[in-house]
């Protein structure tokens, strides 16, 4: 009967600068969770006796747990799970619908910061503690989050890792967007769109790192065996990613229609709305659905491609099948085929 | 971030008024549909009201003509204009918005209608 007692509960705290503090999210069979505060019995208001989740607190390698409650801002790009029993029980959860789910917050307290001695002890044969190995994604100037060059620290070496096109990586993938608390892997990114063409002028962390890594275990487990250090490499790609946790995401409206859930999609990344042309990537209802989804509408009911007769229409295009899967917008400035969607009615 | 903060919530009698206000901060410009929901003592959440940028509105059944949902672009607030309230209109009532496929919740106001 799994619980947050158990030696092996993997657990982690997202959505926050610190891994002591965020969104309760949980490794169950299939992968992440977000746990929402209204699991077992709880109202979603309920704070609870902290000390209950002091087991989470130290195998996170953190400080004792200062609260328990709902987390203030609910974000949930992956699934979530409400779980009944005693509290600190995972053996019988659900998914629950992402929109009806408040996630579950937990702070502990920060470990204590050493600060090292002034005089330098006589050397002993215990080795000193390193930092953990860790990675960063490095984007480029007004770049976005979970988006850019993959660097990989070890103790006090870091750099960046080379990648052939043709390695077989996709669960390395998947555990480095992980890692990074970015989600799953979407896709590879040139090295013009991660940025790794740096300005003379920029600040000296983010010229490039004196150490390349190379991919040493594709199905790694834990960073430190997944790379091996090499000598730089003056040519060559390095591994940059884009994450599914990504901003700014695309947003979408319904405009023109007679209702909150009908109209002619429009789409924005940030800075003005355009309509959203029609795509061949897109002809399945997948892509309508989010955009559903997004109004708070129902399901999608119809789609249908507005004719494109005029040469002087002009929107946006995503080359994916779904909007949230596309980082970049793409202009189109000619022979623009809106798509005008029905969704139902919100009301179950 | 996205941050949605309720309030205006209270005890008030069968046949009174309350307006509700969502004030949302953080990436506020861009969430185009905010929706108030509201959750009974051991019952489902249910949608109450939605209303979009362009101040287009749908209601659920059960709170049409009673209620109506505005919204302040400028001020980046939301209002539930609650009128004729009844017994079971008591709740936890939440703003909810998306930024893409990712949700925000505010904390919730509790309203409890007195008969």
């Known amino acids: 009967r799994l619980s947050w007692y158990d030696p092996d509960f993997q657990a982690r705290l997202t959505r926050s600068n610190s891994k002591c503090q965020g969104q309760l999210e949980v490794y169950l069979k299939d992968g992440w969770h977000m746990v929402c505060s209204q699991s077992w019995g709880r109202s979603s208001k309920q704070w609870e006796d902290p000390s209950q989740a002091s087991k989470v607190c130290q195998r996170l390698n953190c400080g004792v747990p200062l609260s328990l409650g709902p987390f203030l801002v609910t974000y949930t790009p992956q699934s979530s799970i409400i779980c009944y029993g005693q509290l600190g029980s995972f053996s019988n959860c659900s998914h629950s619908r992402n929109d009806m789910c408040h996630s579950l917050g937990l702070t502990c307290l920060e470990p204590q910061k050493t600060t090292p001695p002034t005089t330098r002890p006589p050397p002993t044969t215990t080795p000193e503690p390193t930092a953990p190995p860790r990675l960063q994604l490095v984007a480029q100037s007004g770049g976005q989050h979970c988006a850019g060059v993959v660097e990989f620290y070890s103790g006090s070496l870091g750099g960046t890792i080379s990648y052939e096109a043709q390695d077989k990586t996709q669960d390395l993938e998947n555990f480095l967007c992980n890692n990074l608390q970015c989600g799953s892997f979407l896709k590879h990114l040139p090295e013009t769109e991660a940025g790794r063409a740096q300005d003379p002028g920029e600040p000296r962390e983010h010229q490039p790192l004196p150490i390349q890594w190379k991919i040493q275990n594709s199905s790694c487990t834990s960073l430190e065996h997944c790379f091996r250090k090499i000598k730089p490499q003056k040519s060559g790609r390095v591994l940059a990613l884009l994450c599914s946790g990504f901003q700014p995401k695309v947003q979408s409206r319904l405009v023109g229609g007679s209702s909150i859930c009908e109209g002619t999609v429009e789409v924005r990344q940030g800075a003005q709305w355009a309509a959203l042309c029609d795509s061949s990537s897109a002809r399945s209802s997948l892509r309508w659905e989010e955009v559903c989804r997004e109004q708070q509408c129902g399901s999608v009911n119809s789609y249908r491609v507005l004719d494109a007769g005029d040469p002087t229409s002009r929107g946006l295009f995503c080359p994916h099948q779904k909007l949230s899967q596309c980082h970049e917008l793409w202009e189109r400035n000619s022979y623009c085929k809106k798509v005008f969607v029905t969704c139902q009615d919100p009301n179950p | 971030q996205v941050q949605l903060q309720e309030s205006g919530g209270g005890l008030v009698q069968a046949g009174g008024s309350l307006r509700l206000s969502c004030a949302t901060s953080g990436i506020t410009s861009s969430i185009n549909v905010i929706g108030w929901y509201r959750q009974a003592p051991g019952k489902q959440r249910e949608l109450v009201a939605l209303?979009?940028?362009?101040?287009?509105?749908h209601y659920a059944d059960s709170v049409k003509g009673r209620f109506t949902i505005s919204r302040d672009n400028a001020k980046n607030t939301v209002f539930l204009q609650m009128n004729s309230l009844k017994p079971e209109d008591t709740a936890e009532y939440y703003c909810?918005?998306?930024?893409?496929?990712?949700?925000?919740w505010g904390e919730g106001t509790q309203v409890t209608v007195s008969s």
């Open positions: 909810h918005g998306r930024y893409g496929i990712d949700n925000y």
């Open positions: 209303v979009n940028s362009g101040g287009q509105t």
